[in-house]
């Protein structure tokens, strides 16, 4: 990894605990201001592998609401608007970091947690293996 | 929102600061142990809207490495393996939380940051509007 020279103005929070506990400012800085506001807007409907979005809420997690994609079809939509079952609609998954209240119900104490979320769906061509 | 009864065993970190600063244990708990290990494995190659993955590294961010998807084609791959330019390969984007060292170069002090990442690509059929 890259070694970062320590800033002398850092808060004095010597690490007596293992696993390491750090201070985190929850006032979120949003770096998306210059990004295109449309984002994935209506892709869930217009994709050849469309998906539905399901709300997953957990008050013990931060963020408490996460949207999960579920592919609508087993196959993909063809040029005629029909489902082509020779293709597969599959979820694109991503590991994300969330904060889990630990101990439970504590407002100011969290643990980092990695969770896998489905962000949307894509259409894949399966590799066909002929069994002898 | 949902009101959570406070656990009496919570660390005593009364909120003198605004914006709110909390304690976070960086020993990551991975909840993905039971998930399918393949994930989006080779979807980036087999999708009808394939993508390349680009490494984005920033030592002042946690996680320091994030992979960004860039769609390979403007159009989508058709049944013959050719690019169909009547369709669009588009990135599926997601807002994720990361930790940004603040003040810079500090090992134990962070601020939550929201960034937009492209996770993969999907193929969309545009609605065609005829301009008068």
């Amino acid at each position: 990894g890259i070694t970062i020279p320590r800033n002398p103005g850092c808060p004095n929070s010597e690490d007596k605990n293992f696993p390491r506990t750090v201070m985190v400012n929850l006032n979120i800085h949003n770096r998306n201001t210059n990004t295109n506001p449309k984002r994935s807007s209506d892709y869930y409907n217009r994709s050849t592998s469309p998906w539905n979005l399901h709300r997953n809420e957990d008050p013990e997690r931060y963020p408490s609401v996460i949207w999960e994609a579920k592919c609508r079809h087993l196959g993909c939509i063809n040029a005629d608007g029909n489902v082509d079952y020779h293709m597969n609609s599959v979820p694109i998954q991503q590991e994300i970091l969330v904060l889990r209240r630990e101990p439970p119900h504590c407002p100011n104490s969290f643990r980092l947690e990695k969770i896998l979320v489905s962000v949307g769906c894509t259409c894949v061509t399966p590799i066909v293996h002929h069994v002898a | 929102g949902i009101t959570i009864p406070r656990n009496p065993g919570c660390p005593n970190s009364e909120d003198k600061n605004f914006p709110r600063t909390v304690m976070v244990n960086l020993n990551i708990h991975n909840r993905n142990t039971n998930t399918n290990p393949k994930r989006s494995s080779d979807y980036y190659n087999r999708s009808t809207s394939p993508w390349n993955l680009h490494r984005n590294e920033d030592p002042e961010r946690y996680p320091s490495v994030i992979w960004e998807a860039k769609c390979r084609h403007l159009g989508c791959i058709n049944a013959d393996g050719n690019v169909d330019y009547h369709m669009n390969s588009v990135p599926i984007q997601q807002e994720i939380l990361v930790l940004r060292r603040e003040p810079p170069h500090c090992p134990n002090s962070f601020r939550l940051e929201k960034i937009l990442v492209s996770v993969g690509c999907t193929c969309v059929t545009p609605i065609v509007h005829h301009v008068a």
Partner: nanobody, 118 residues
Framework: EVQLVESRGGLVQAGGSLRLSCAAS????????MRWFRQAPGKEREFVAG????????YYADSVKGRFTMSADNAKNTVYLQMNSLKPEDTAVYYC???????????LGQGTQVTVSS
Amino acid sequence: EVQLVESRGGLVQAGGSLRLSCAASGGTFSVFAMRWFRQAPGKEREFVAGISWTGGTTYYADSVKGRFTMSADNAKNTVYLQMNSLKPEDTAVYYCAVDVGGGSDRYLGQGTQVTVSS
């Protein structure tokens, strides 16, 4: 509402050149890509060339590669199609298209006639 202003086509001799332009305007929209399509009598509309707005990458149909060049002026939401070494089989109505809304909506121009005589 998106408007498209396409330049006039014309009649050219085989081996000659022609430049088409197309400007997108109207309201606030974010361009995803711009393309040229063409349709010859009795045939389906086919892709000619395209440009991705963010990356600036250009794409061409095999039939025009090396002869046609597409370029863009992003600030003006305008694209150009420089057509060289024209052939009679390039005769068609050429349509400009702009994709907005992240690629979910396509606005197709009225088209301009290009005729290549032998």
